[in-house]
């Protein structure tokens, strides 16, 4: 009998955003969730292959917190926080899930100031990153995944194109933060955005708490 399993996508580390492998073995112990074992800073982490000692593949676990301390850049003017996952390679769907696991969403850009701030953070990088733009629900046309109004546009010329196969948006450093549409299933780095909520409590990603366990009739949960 097994619990329904949701991938927990890692942050930073050396696994390019791959999800935790649960359970995993570290220092001759088996871990059935994220752990801070072996870290002085207390950050939760997991292995992304079953045997950490053999492969040494790992990443930090996503946490829903009410601040922007770890892994986030904060715009002091707007209080919005941004996380650039340059080393990750996830599909748009996986990137969205990774942001959601941190109480965030994929990046939406709703004004020129925000675009300028993002461009500043992208300076020095050469990358194409997923943002929240998508037209996956074609009844609504292009929209932001966090439901922000699409009132500011920065499409590159001749974009968006190929409506049948390129339904998710990217931001590109090569065009000074211009937007393109791409095939949602390709693997790319991504940007998350959140507004810190003073009422939110930090919660580790315990994807197995309060989950109804479904077993065959002869099995016990």
């Amino acid at each position: 009998c097994a619990l329904p399993y949701h991938e927990v996508y890692t942050i930073q580390g050396n696994s390019h955003g791959k999800p935790c492998t649960i359970p995993f073995k570290y220092d001759n112990q088996w871990f059935h969730g994220c752990t801070s074992t072996g870290r002085e800073d207390g950050h939760l982490w997991c292995a992304t292959t079953q045997d950490y000692g053999k492969d040494e593949r790992w990443g930090f676990c996503p946490i829903k917190s009410n601040d922007c301390e770890t892994f986030w850049d904060k715009d002091q003017l707007t209080d919005s926080c941004y996380q650039f996952n340059f080393q990750s390679t996830l599909s748009w769907r996986e990137a969205w899930a990774s942001c959601e696991q941190q109480g965030a969403d994929l990046l939406s850009i709703t004004e020129i100031h925000e675009q300028t701030y993002i461009n500043g953070l992208l300076t020095g990088y050469s990358s194409t990153l997923w943002i929240g733009l998508n037209d996956l629900d074609t009844s609504g046309g292009w929209q932001w995944s966090d439901n922000s109004p699409l009132k500011y546009l920065n499409w590159e010329s001749d974009q968006p194109d190929n409506p049948s196969e390129e339904n998710c948006g990217v931001i590109r450093t090569e065009s000074s933060g211009g937007w393109q549409n791409r095939d949602c299933s390709i693997a790319l780095p991504y940007v998350c955005k959140k507004k810190p909520n003073a009422t939110a409590e930090p919660t580790p990603p315990d994807r197995w708490a309060n989950v109804k366990v479904e077993c065959e009739p002869s099995w016990q949960p």
Epitope: L136, D161, P163, S164, S185
Partner: antibody, heavy 117, light 108 residues
């Protein structure tokens, strides 16, 4: 209203050839990639081939490579599938399908290809 | 063999709920869509994206997903829901559309 109408199916002997056509209307044909999907009698759906909006890139399932060629004529709003060296296992209903965002949202009614001696 | 795996057949009593599942690696990367096909007819899209329905599809059809598994649920199955159901997702550039083998739903 989006419409896709296939034609060109029929009975053909093994090793023979057929050319299927799909007439599209109700949308800007030249903006969309297009696909052929087939269904053998009593079996499931199998993607066969697709072509980019400008015809610059084509892909097909391994089992038809070198035998089937997908093409399009944007001036005629038409999609084609040239089928050569046909085999009994190619017997199927062939559907023309237009993709939307991550899905195949419009299908034709299908045309039956029967390969038999 | 299909890149997506479905149970071949399920049955449901009239008015009851049935869930059809679809498993495959491409479902981690892409959202599933579901098609209904009745004998002699072309497939019809019933659910797509997270849990969206094209116009004209009754709200008793709903979709969900977790990890590499997608589900189609018919809540309060009707006689006209008896059909084959196929899952589908974006695949790779070499094989851009992955299909499940289909599930035959019988309404008793």
């Amino acid at each position: 209203e989006v419409q896709l109408v296939e034609s060109g199916g029929g009975l053909v002997k093994p090793g023979g050839s057929l050319r299927l056509s799909c007439a599209a209307s109700g949308f800007t044909f030249s903006s969309y990639s297009m696909n052929w999907v087939r269904q053998a009698p009593g079996k499931g759906l199998e993607w066969v081939a697709n072509i980019k909006p400008d015809g610059s890139e084509r892909h097909s399932v391994d089992s038809v490579k070198g035998r089937f060629t997908i093409s399009r004529d944007n001036s005629k709003n038409s999609l084609y599938l040239q089928m050569n060296s046909l085999r009994a296992e190619d017997t199927a209903v062939y559907y023309c399908a237009r993709p939307g965002a991550g899905r195949l949202d419009y299908w034709g009614q299908g045309t039956l290809v029967t390969v038999s001696s | 063999s299909s890149e997506l795996t479905q149970d071949p057949a399920v049955s449901v009593a009239l008015g009851q709920t049935v869930r059809i599942t679809c498993q495959g690696d491409s479902l981690r990367r892409s959202y599933a869509s579901w098609y209904q096909q009745k004998p002699g007819q072309a497939p019809v899209l019933v659910v797509y994206f997270k849990n969206n329905r094209p116009s004209g599809i009754p709200d008793r059809f709903s979709g969900s997903s977790s990890g590499n598994t997608a589900s189609l649920t018919i809540t309060g199955a009707q006689a006209e829901d008896e059909a084959d159901y196929y899952c589908n997702s974006r695949g790779t550039s070499r094989n851009p559309w992955a299909f499940g083998g289909g599930t035959k739903v019988t309404v008793l």
